[in-house]
Interface confidence: medium
């Protein structure tokens, strides 16, 4: 099964996110690069590069990590940088692109789920105060047994992709994150152009699966009021 995203044009009046992920008040889930807003009926991106400031990897997109833009640079100035591909040097897992992890300073494939489960944290699904408001948003928790999900399965609250079962990634869902399916061939994907169009992402897709890349669908005839589709395609 696949997941949809409430994404389209940027709008100016969407309030900022809550201070933390559900169940993790200390974990900031904030605006990330290449993000879309709920809005009109087109998917818009910006070609020019706009560095997005960050404090931790979780604030960046699935294909980015948070670091100082220059080696030995000011630690207080960090931005979201493009992830490192296979065989590139790394210092931690988040630096490597989806489908890879950092081993002995090099990004290597995680095809066989080498490190899945290495960072298994207990996800406590508690949402703090029942009526919490921050920065223009109100979040009210509801209590329904059918909303409970087993940890690691599709729809489970997560902090990072290693919290999710095989074939799933940890992607934003409102101001939390949940496990969603990694995209398969032919499925629509989100293509960020040079990480432009920064804003608040409330719904986020997973990345394309192993051996696939996100490219414009060649046979997609662009109708009025619709965007050019990007789909996961074989390399």
């Amino acid at each position: 099964t696949l997941n949809s995203v409430l994404n389209s044009n940027a709008i100016k009046n969407l309030p900022p996110p809550l201070g933390g992920a559900a169940g993790h008040p200390g974990s900031a889930v904030s605006a990330a690069p290449g993000i879309l807003y709920p809005g009109g009926n087109k998917y818009q991106t910006i070609d020019n590069y706009q560095p997005y400031p960050c404090a931790e990897d979780e604030e960046c997109g699935t294909d980015e990590y948070c670091a100082s833009p220059t080696r030995g640079g000011d630690a207080g100035v960090q931005i979201c940088l493009a992830c490192r591909k296979r065989r590139k040097r790394c210092m931690r897992h988040a630096m490597c692109c989806p489908g890879n992890y950092c081993k002995n300073g090099i990004c290597v494939s995680s095809d066989q789920n080498h490190f899945r489960g290495e960072i298994e944290e207990t996800i406590t699904e508690s949402f703090g105060n029942d009526h919490s408001t921050l920065d223009g948003y109100s979040r009210r928790t509801t209590l329904s047994s059918k909303m409970y999900h087993t940890k690691g399965q599709e729809g489970s609250v997560c902090l990072r992709s290693s919290d999710c079962a095989s074939g799933l990634c940890c992607a934003r869902h409102f101001w939390s994150k949940i496990c969603k399916p990694v995209l398969k061939e032919g499925q629509v994907c989100t293509k960020h152009r040079r990480k432009g169009s920064h804003g608040l992402e409330i719904f986020q897709r997973c990345y394309c699966g192993e051996g696939l890349s996100c490219r414009i669908q060649k046979d997609h005839h662009q109708a009025s009021n619709s965007s050019r589709l990007h789909t996961c395609q074989r390399h």
């Epitope: 997941n3 409430l6 009926n41 998917y43 509801t142 609250v157 619709s226 965007s227």
Partner: nanobody
């Protein structure tokens, strides 16, 4: 493709109430969330409220908090927006959107046209 059909709009006096409905149909396996947005004449579309089954929460814009209540029937793929104590500034076309597990292609609301929306006019 997924269709979202909104209904329940109309003309109401300030202080009055309306209940909007949004029915999602198409290749839907399950819904993670449904939400409402609105667009007043000459303004950008804005978030109003949403409900998430995955993180067991409802979300509201400050401008409607305490007056609007979002609910949903997951088995019917339908969301509702109960609007009380309506104000003239609530006048807008109200649109529905959904996040979920869809069979076939992976859709987001930019991949297909929004529904026509339902017009809410608050005026005396």
């Amino acid at each position: 493709e997924v269709q979202l059909v909104e209904s329940g709009g109309g003309l109401v006096q300030p202080g009055g109430s309306l209940r909007l409905s949004c029915a999602a149909s198409g290749n839907i396996d399950r819904l993670y969330a449904m939400g409402w947005f609105r667009q007043a004449p000459g303004k950008e579309r804005e978030f109003v409220a949403a409900i998430s089954w995955s993180v067991s929460s409802t979300y509201y814009a400050d401008s409607v908090k305490g007056r609007f209540t979002i609910s949903a029937d997951n088995s019917k793929n339908t969301a509702y927006l109960q609007m009380n104590s309506l104000k003239p500034e609530d006048t807008a076309v109200y649109y529905c959107a959904a996040e979920g597990g869809y069979s076939g292609t992976y859709y987001y609301t930019g991949d297909f046209d929004w529904g026509q929306g339902t017009l809410v006019t608050v005026s005396s």
